[in-house]
């Protein structure tokens, strides 16, 4: 008689990352009997929802269900039907919704309410939709990358199973860049965290971690661009804005009402003698860099050391994984290699920004023009943020690893979020027989 394969004893989980510019659905899978082990959960699917972020549906909330359908259908196809009812679904909204909530709590609640009603229609175990804090976003990103890098495992190995593994248990710092916010999270070296708001204490797998984290709202790449435009139009002599962060020959008309729509530009708002202005690209990296630096207030610091805007930042320590838009932008610019020095990155950015817009459009025909036009700004912004904002240097640049995936799972906050909510990160090191779930993050 043939041996019949036993059915796989696996579990699934779904997390939707409702970001400012788009929503992504992640499906995770793990062996049921090993859920307390480190490194066993892996991503089996990412489905990027076609369209903008959920905050854009504020005037047409009844359509959120339509928008989410394709990716939720995909989840139904990927996860075996027998597992549907026990598969948890979580939706976490980030800075785009934090900004909407700042403008109107009622509107943000209405969007989340419709999201919850829509997701409740599916055959999964829907666990809720909420706006996660910037601190959570930073912390869960840090947990994700260190979990995937095997940093929480107590077993020392003589071989390396993941990239960037230095075979020690020193954790990686996490650098996350979104459209509306950016997070920096790491374990400082024997340094007291001077501001309580930036301090996190974890006990994971039997070890204590004192973690620094901060989320800079309005300093994601899209909101930083709006800030820069709002700042620069203040001093423009007319409705032409000659902008060094866009390629020579690039032209775009911007509505002043759109510019001042976001809370991020409130500090630069003024009455302008025109309703529209035209961006005209001049493609100059150095000038673009200088303009971006004006977004960082470094003149005031109530602590021993700050990042910018009076926010405490301890001295940088160890290696860092830079993911999300840090990775996507640098990947597009072909600058993710470990071998590329900071000086080389700067040199490449100078050349890229100086390329004529018509030439860029021809070279990258398959890229949406809106995104394509902003890579010069985004690349320059990343350099400015890392070097002047977070105080990386030409020497410490080599400690930044631009990471898209680790072991097939996307670097980002979603995996850490699910691990925490499904109680899969025990505070104590599990014995060979799983302990009862007692204490968790």
């Amino acid at each position: 008689t043939q041996n019949k394969a036993l059915p796989e004893n696996v579990k699934y989980g779904i997390v939707l990352d409702a970001g400012s510019s788009h929503t992504s659905l992640y499906i995770y899978k793990w062996p049921a009997e090993k859920e307390n082990d480190t490194g066993v959960v892996h991503q089996v699917e990412e489905c990027r929802v076609k369209g903008p972020g959920i905050s854009k549906f504020v005037q047409k909330v009844n359509e959120i269900g339509i928008y989410l359908t394709d990716c939720m259908e995909r989840a139904r196809e990927v996860i075996p039907r027998s597992q549907h009812q026990e598969t948890p679904v979580y939706l976490g909204a980030t800075a785009g919704m934090r900004l909407l909530r700042m403008e109107s709590e009622e509107l943000a609640d209405r969007v989340l309410d419709v999201v919850e009603r829509s997701l409740s229609n599916y055959p999964f175990d829907f666990q809720g939709a909420r706006i996660i804090t910037g601190q959570e976003e930073g912390a869960y990103g840090w947990i994700t990358i260190n979990y995937l890098l095997g940093k929480f495992s107590q077993k020392t190995r003589w071989f390396s199973i993941v990239p960037y593994e230095t075979n020690n248990q020193e954790t990686f710092g996490a650098l996350d860049l979104g459209g509306a916010s950016t997070q920096v999270t790491f374990v400082p070296q024997n340094q007291t965290i001077e501001s309580p708001d930036n301090a996190l204490q974890f006990r994971l797998y039997g070890k204590d971690y004192n973690v620094y984290t901060h989320s800079f709202l309005c300093y994601g790449k899209d909101q930083a661009l709006w800030q820069k435009l709002a700042k620069d139009i203040q001093v423009a002599s007319n409705e032409i804005l000659r902008d060094p962060c866009f390629h020579p020959g690039y032209k775009k008309v911007v509505n002043v009402s759109d510019l001042y729509k976001t809370p991020c530009t409130k500090r630069f708002e003024m009455t302008l003698p025109f309703q529209q202005f035209e961006i005209q690209g001049i493609g100059n990296y150095q000038q673009c860099h200088q303009s971006i630096l004006e977004l960082f207030n470094t003149s005031y610091c109530p602590y021993s050391q700050c990042a910018f805007n009076g926010i405490f930042l301890p001295p940088l320590q160890g290696d860092f994984g830079a993911f999300s838009a840090f990775y996507f932008v640098m990947k597009f610019l072909n600058l993710t290699s470990e071998k590329v020095s900071q000086e080389k990155v700067t040199e490449m950015m100078k050349k890229f920004c100086a390329q004529p817009w018509e030439e860029i459009k021809t070279s990258y025909a398959g890229v949406k023009e809106k995104y394509l036009s902003e890579y010069c700004f985004s690349g320059t912004y990343i350099l400015s943020l890392l070097l002047q904002g977070y105080h990386f240097t030409a020497d410490s640049w080599e400690h930044i690893h631009f990471i898209g995936k680790i072991q097939g799972s996307d670097a980002g906050w979603t995996l850490g979020y699910m691990l925490n909510l499904t109680n899969m990160i025990p505070a104590e090191q599990p014995l060979s027989t799983p302990l009862s779930h007692s204490t968790y993050v």
Partner: antibody, heavy 121, light 111 residues
């Protein structure tokens, strides 16, 4: 500003294979689905299938599955429909179409001008 | 496959009147609280144009005189008041499940 430019008319013999293209400008095909629809002369619309160019997942009407293939090349923002083992029943105007939400949450639809495929001996 | 039936096959009306076109599905096209029914307009020699999606939502740039309603298996497209450029063929399409299917069409002509 968004345009879908389809390849020119084709006259082919029964049993032959033909590949028609749909070049999109002003919109990245990775951000939507590309649908193919056909219309035999003087008749109604028939949905053939769709592709998600971001991950090359395709869905077909089972009656076309195996004989028709949908592909996409995101580097040149172009989708393709390949028709094989053609018969006179396949004579039709073939349209490519995009529909979905744009960056401002408006629901759009864009169509190619159509490619007439005539199958005749 | 979900089969769609449209009625009437032809509709003759005058300018300014209200046009009502029906579409019936062989099974419900509702799922997850959404009715997956779309309406398209097609003029001779032109590709179709989306008028209504998800039963009642207007496509981009579609005039307010076009409206859609219904759920489950019965759907209606209303055009009120009729204008000269509205005389065309109208198709319903379900997108609840693959294969997405179209109705046979309703020809709206000037009386």
């Amino acid at each position: 500003q968004v345009q879908l430019l389809q390849s020119g008319a084709e006259v082919v013999k029964p049993g032959a294979t033909v590949k028609i293209s749909c070049k999109v400008s002003g919109f990245s095909i990775k951000d939507t689905y590309v649908h193919w629809v056909r219309q035999p002369p003087g008749q109604g619309l028939e949905w053939i299938g769709k592709i998600d160019p971001a991950n090359v997942n395709t869905k077909f009407d089972p009656k076309f599955q195996g004989r028709f293939t949908i592909t996409a090349d995101t580097s040149i923002n172009t989708a393709y429909l390949e028709l094989s083992s053609l018969t006179s029943e396949d004579t039709a105007v073939y349209y490519c179409a995009l529909y979905g939400y744009d960056d401002d949450a408006y629901y759009f639809d864009y169509w190619g001008q159509g490619t007439l495929v005539t199958v005749s001996s | 496959n979900i089969v769609l039936t449209q009625s009437p096959a032809t509709l003759s009306l005058s300018l300014g009147q209200r046009a009502t076109i029906s579409c019936r599905a062989s099974e419900s096209v509702d799922n997850y609280g959404i009715s997956f029914m779309n309406w398209f307009q097609q003029k001779p020699g032109q590709p179709p144009q989306l008028l209504i999606y998800a039963a009642s939502n207007q496509g981009s740039g579609i005039p307010a005189r076009f409206s859609g309603s219904g759920s489950g298996t019965d759907f209606t497209l209303n055009i009120n008041p009729l204008e000269s450029e509205d005389f065309a063929v109208y198709y319903c399409q379900q997108s609840k499940e693959v294969p997405y299917t179209f109705g046979p069409g309703t020809k709206l002509e000037i009386k």
